[in-house]
């Protein structure tokens, strides 16, 4: 039985075209800022807004930088190391149940409550009983929704999981 | 969903050839390896070879080299290996793998493996 070969010993019989601004890898890996070339010997930056890399990682690819939807705010762009930072609009909220998605926050509290929250990109506002002070969990109203994406979510090219 | 499927798998006299298939589906990713491993009873998972899609780079074991050719088809999304001058310790379980990392000679680099196809010299 022959051991596995690492890349050391590998020479490849094909190098892949010149892409962009190239480095060596340490130990195998790129730095945040880039992916490694099909042969192992380079570093190949990501391109600036248009994808990017987080980690030290040896991936033929960088992952792509998403794209604030309509009903978003960007909060910071992509760059080659950070994703887009994308925030909901003033007036929406983001629900942990549902990420992908800006809802309206509502307007008021039921009958017989109070308001003690405000409507933030992450939160509904918050309403407690008037005597007992117990949270209320509603539903919220129907209203038209925005499909948009999570915050920092990597928009990636497909799932790895297939 | 990715999905590898081997074939061209059969019993061949000693000094012989054969030729493997592994079609894949599913794939989207902007550039992958696709590998070839086999596995003989009681033994480790081998690397084989692998070849890039973009570039095209290719990689063998030493193993093998000289005597095993990858080569792909890009329009139908499939690896070959082609075996000649087999010998009976070739006999073993050939699998096909995808990756998404450089220089993936190793077992745990790839993602997504096939069934395997039987090859008994």
């Known amino acids: 039985e022959s051991a596995l070969i690492t890349q050391q010993d590998l020479a490849p019989q094909q190098r892949a075209a010149p892409q962009q601004k190239r480095s060596s890898p340490s130990e195998g890996l790129c730095p945040p800022g880039h992916h490694i070339s099909e042969d192992g010997r380079d570093c190949i930056s990501c391109k600036y807004g248009q994808d990017y890399s987080t980690h030290w990682n040896d991936l033929l690819f960088c992952l792509r930088c998403t794209r604030c939807d309509s009903g978003e705010v960007e909060l910071s762009p992509c760059t080659t190391t950070r994703n887009t930072v994308c925030q909901c609009e003033e007036g929406t909220f983001r629900e942990e149940d549902s990420p992908e998605m800006c809802r309206k926050c509502r307007t008021g509290c039921p009958r017989g409550m109070v308001k003690v929250g405000d409507c933030t990109p992450w939160s509904d506002i918050e309403c407690v009983h008037k005597e007992s002070g117990t949270k209320h969990s509603g539903e919220v109203p129907a209203v038209e929704e925005t499909v948009t994406s999570s915050p920092g979510t990597p928009a990636s090219p497909c799932s790895l999981s297939g | 969903e990715v999905q590898l499927l081997e074939s061209g798998g059969g019993e061949v006299q000693p000094g012989g050839s054969l030729r493997l298939s592994c079609a894949a589906s599913?794939?989207?990713?902007?550039?992958?390896?696709m590998g070839w491993f086999r596995q003989a009873p009681g033994k480790e998972r081998e690397f084989l070879a692998v070849?890039?899609?973009?570039?095209?780079?290719?990689y063998y074991a030493e193993s093998v080299k000289g005597r095993f050719t990858i080569s792909r088809d890009n329009a139908k999304n499939t690896v070959y290996l082609q075996m000649s001058s087999l010998r009976a310790e070739d006999t073993a379980v050939y699998y096909c793998?995808?990756?998404?990392?450089?220089?993936?000679?190793?077992?745990?680099?790839?993602?997504?493996w096939g069934q395997g196809t039987l090859v008994t010299v």
């Open positions: 599913g794939l989207t990713f902007p550039n992958y390896g």
């Open positions: 070849i890039y899609w973009s570039g095209g780079t290719v």
């Open positions: 793998a995808v990756t998404i990392r450089g220089a993936a000679t190793q077992t745990w680099k790839y993602d997504y």
